[in-house]
Interface confidence: low
């Protein structure tokens, strides 16, 4: 049978050729008739046999980690019969571990990302070296990690690679640490090979800044015409931390005026001092209030970083603006008797400049001929006044600062013209009445009722009468009926168209009025021709009729 | 270079109080925290407590919380130090020094110091 | 008594090295960062190392600090006359909220 033993060969051998081993079968005796043969892949090439002895070389330098083993096949042949001594068999070649390779990190580049105040202890990442050297062959491929640069903020466990925070790191004075990792083969002893990585450790925030003011006071002004809304100026705290945990609010903590209010640009981070209330120079000059700022989002854990919230001082100074004159009254009503003479009081009005100079004032009226005012303010007519041609006026009156004539205010003054009885009651319209010839006694002619253009105090009550001259002689007679009308009739029985065509009556009206006012009204009746039904028949005016309505045969 | 330098020495009676300043010039006064360290005659140095300038955020060590008063003025880069109802064993040179960003990092400058002897 | 423990005096002759050492908790040393000041007689204090082991301009580099968990250490190395100072070890200390200082180690360099 075949004689062997395990054969190895050393990696890497820098010799021609290197003796592997030898191959023989018991049947040979040394004197040279058998012969060996070589066979499979790299035989011939990499390995070569002596056909005489069985001795095998490697004539190649090998590579273990690109090949570790070759199986060939082995015969044996008399050479002087040609005849298969042994039967072919099959053999194993394998390349023996030299420490060759050095650790590498393939899962480069390494990045880790850790919370800034994390405890000693925390795990950061894990760098895993690989080494294409043998495992099992003795401590070539036995890595143990190191920490070239890093400390003392972090750790590598040297089995492992696991690196770990061996000192409390902030993110706000330094984010970002490059950690370089070392790994060594035959754990660390004379001889081993090394390899080298870089992590890149960033620190993500937490919140362990609260805001904190850049001022310990601001000083803000305000124009006392600004309207409320208005924002006056911003005040700005900082924070070391970054994104969320920036995020800031501001409020007011004192304000004793409740004159103020912040609110929080959340995008610039600033707070907004605003108006809540209008101001006023001349009532508060300046104002102090205290504002504070807190994070937006703190996590309960964080809260020692938070107990106080940081304050500021703001001293807010209002800016006097010349403002105009400001009338006691938004508007004034007088009252005045029409018919009283020119140059009569009417009322006075009166304005302030409210800024504290105290501006002398000046008065005018815009477009009235009838009225006056002087710089004190009193309104006067300038002529008599007709309750019946204008029973209001509408003034404006301008209050101008003597100092600065562009500060103008003005109001709308009513001068109500009050009623003198200086009216007596009229006809309400013009009467022209008929009577026939054969009319009898108490007979309705007309109807008439009266007007009086004065305002009435309480209600109108006319009062109607004929003349005196025409009470003692007249055809006609009058009754007031207590409603403001009366009624003409006839006093006698029987009329002449010939004789006496037409009648002027005389009616006195008059008024309640103090003193009673009368006026003569005259009342025309014209006497026309009727037949015994009452038609009229001829009246000496032929239009009166048609315009009576009467037809004429 | 930093330089941080305190008010003169003071005697005061026991029961009244006194007020160190330190004035700070050459950094960003409003950037960095202030500590104020006392050292008694003889014996070693003692923290009392620490004042952010901008905001004037204070934390006082336990021992003299309700006694003790830290106040800043930007205007001025000056921080004050101001400890009540004094008591013999007050007696000290009083330390204001440097801190940093955070409240935990180390102080690199420190005045020259202030003595307070209170006797009656 | 001091929450951060320091022994109150070291000695060593010129030339020798010596280790201060202070030891705290967790709240303290364990979470934060150690500082170490010297006191020259009659001086201010100066900061010596910050951050456990890092030395301000000026400061030689015979003076080093270190820390391991709740306890932290300063040594110094070739000792001169001009090291006779008190040393003290200050933190910030997580549960008082507030800094804490060792009670100081008188260095005596001696001969």
């Known amino acids: 049978g075949w004689v062997w033993n395990q054969f190895f060969v050393p990696e890497e051998m820098n010799t021609t050729s290197h003796h592997v081993g030898r191959l023989r079968s018991d049947l040979d005796n040394g004197n040279n008739s058998f012969q060996y043969k070589l066979l499979g892949a790299g035989a011939g090439s990499t390995f070569i046999i002596d056909e005489r002895t069985g001795d095998i070389y490697a004539i190649e330098k090998l590579d273990r980690e690109e090949r570790s083993l070759y199986i060939l096949r082995a015969q044996v042949i008399d050479i002087t019969t040609g005849r298969a001594v042994e039967p072919e068999s099959e053999f194993v070649i394998k390349v023996s571990d030299i420490n060759d390779n050095e650790p590498k990190f393939l899962d480069e580049p390494y990045e880790a990302i850790v919370p800034e105040m994390s405890p000693e202890g925390t795990l950061v990442i894990q760098v895993t070296a690989s080494d294409a050297d043998d495992p099992s062959s003795g401590n070539n491929a036995r890595l143990l990690y190191s920490l070239l640069q890093g400390q003392p903020y972090f750790s590598v466990e040297p089995t492992t690679g696991v690196i770990r925070i061996s000192s409390k790191m902030d993110r706000e004075l330094q984010d970002e640490y490059w950690v370089i990792i070392q790994a060594k083969d035959m754990i660390g002893q004379p001889g081993a090979l090394s390899g080298t990585t870089s992590v890149l450790i960033k620190l993500s925030d937490v919140n362990d800044n609260k805001p904190i003011f850049k001022e310990s006071l601001y000083r803000l002004t305000v124009s006392e015409s600004a309207p409320t809304g208005t924002s006056i100026g911003t005040i700005m705290a900082y924070d070391n931390d970054i994104g969320e945990n920036a995020e800031m609010d501001y409020s007011i903590e004192e304000d004793d005026s409740q004159t103020f209010d912040i609110i929080t640009n959340h995008e610039t981070q600033e707070g907004i001092v605003i108006l809540k209330k209008k101001v006023n120079f001349e009532h508060q000059n300046h104002y102090g209030i205290r504002a504070k700022v807190k994070n937006h989002h703190v996590d309960e854990q964080l809260m020692k970083y938070h107990t106080e919230a940081s304050t500021t001082f703001i001293k807010i100074q209002v800016e006097d603006v010349d403002e105009p004159p400001l009338f006691l009254l938004p508007y004034y009503i007088f009252e005045i008797f029409e018919e009283t003479p020119q140059g009569s009081f009417v009322g006075v009005v009166s304005a302030t400049d409210p800024d504290n100079r105290k501006s002398p004032i000046r008065y005018s009226i815009t477009r009235s001929k009838v009225f006056n005012i002087d710089d004190n303010g009193t309104i006067t007519t300038t002529n008599s006044l007709d309750r019946e041609i204008s029973a209001w006026y509408n003034l404006s009156i301008t209050a101008t600062e003597k100092y600065n004539i562009e500060q103008i205010s003005s109001i709308p003054v009513y001068v109500q013209v009050l009623n003198i009885n200086d009216h007596a009651p009229e006809f309400s319209q013009y009467y022209e009445s008929y009577v026939c010839e054969n009319a009898g006694s108490g007979q309705v002619i007309q109807t008439i009722s009266a007007v009086d253009r004065d305002e009435s105090i309480e209600e109108h009550h006319f009062y109607f009468n004929l003349s005196v001259e025409d009470t003692n002689s007249s055809s006609f007679t009058i009754i007031d009926n207590q409603d403001n009308t009366a009624v003409i009739l006839t006093n006698r029985t029987g009329f002449n168209l010939q004789e006496e065509p037409i009648f002027y009556i005389s009616i006195l009206i008059a008024d309640n009025g103090i003193p009673s006012l009368t006026s003569t009204n005259t009342l025309t009746i014209h006497v026309c021709d009727c037949d015994d039904s009452g038609s009229t028949q001829t009246c000496q005016y032929q239009e009166l009729m048609l315009s009576m309505g009467f037809k004429t045969e | 270079q930093v330089q941080l330098v305190q008010s003169g020495a003071e005697v005061k009676k026991p029961g009244a109080s006194v007020k160190v300043s330190c004035k700070a010039s050459r950094y960003t006064f409003t950037s960095y925290y202030m500590s104020w360290v006392r050292q008694a005659p003889g014996q070693g140095l003692e923290w009392m407590g620490i004042?952010?300038?901008?905001?004037?955020?204070?934390t006082y060590a336990q021992k003299f919380q309700g006694r003790v008063t830290m106040t800043g003025d930007t205007s001025t880069s000056t921080v004050y130090m101001e400890l009540s109802s004094l008591r013999s064993e007050d007696t000290a040179v009083y330390y204001c020094a440097r801190g940093g960003i955070k409240l935990w990092l180390h102080f690199d400058y420190w005045g020259q110091g202030t003595l307070v002897t209170v006797s009656s | 008594h001091s929450v951060l423990t320091q022994s109150p005096s070291a000695s060593g002759t010129p030339g020798q090295r010596v280790t201060i050492s202070c030891s705290g908790s967790?709240?303290?040393?364990?979470?934060?960062?150690v500082n170490w000041y010297q006191q020259l007689p009659g001086t201010a204090p100066k900061l010596l190392i910050y951050t456990n082991n890092q030395r301000p301009s000026g400061v030689p580099d015979r003076f080093s600090g270190s820390k391991s968990g709740t306890s932290a250490s300063l040594a110094i190395s070739g000792l001169q006359s001009e090291d006779e100072a008190d040393y003290y070890c200050a933190v910030w200390d997580d549960s008082l909220n507030g800094w804490v200082f060792g009670g100081g180690t008188k260095l005596t360099v001696l001969g």
């Open positions: 967790r709240s303290n040393i364990g979470s934060n960062f």
């Open positions: 004042i952010h300038p901008s905001g004037g955020d204070t």
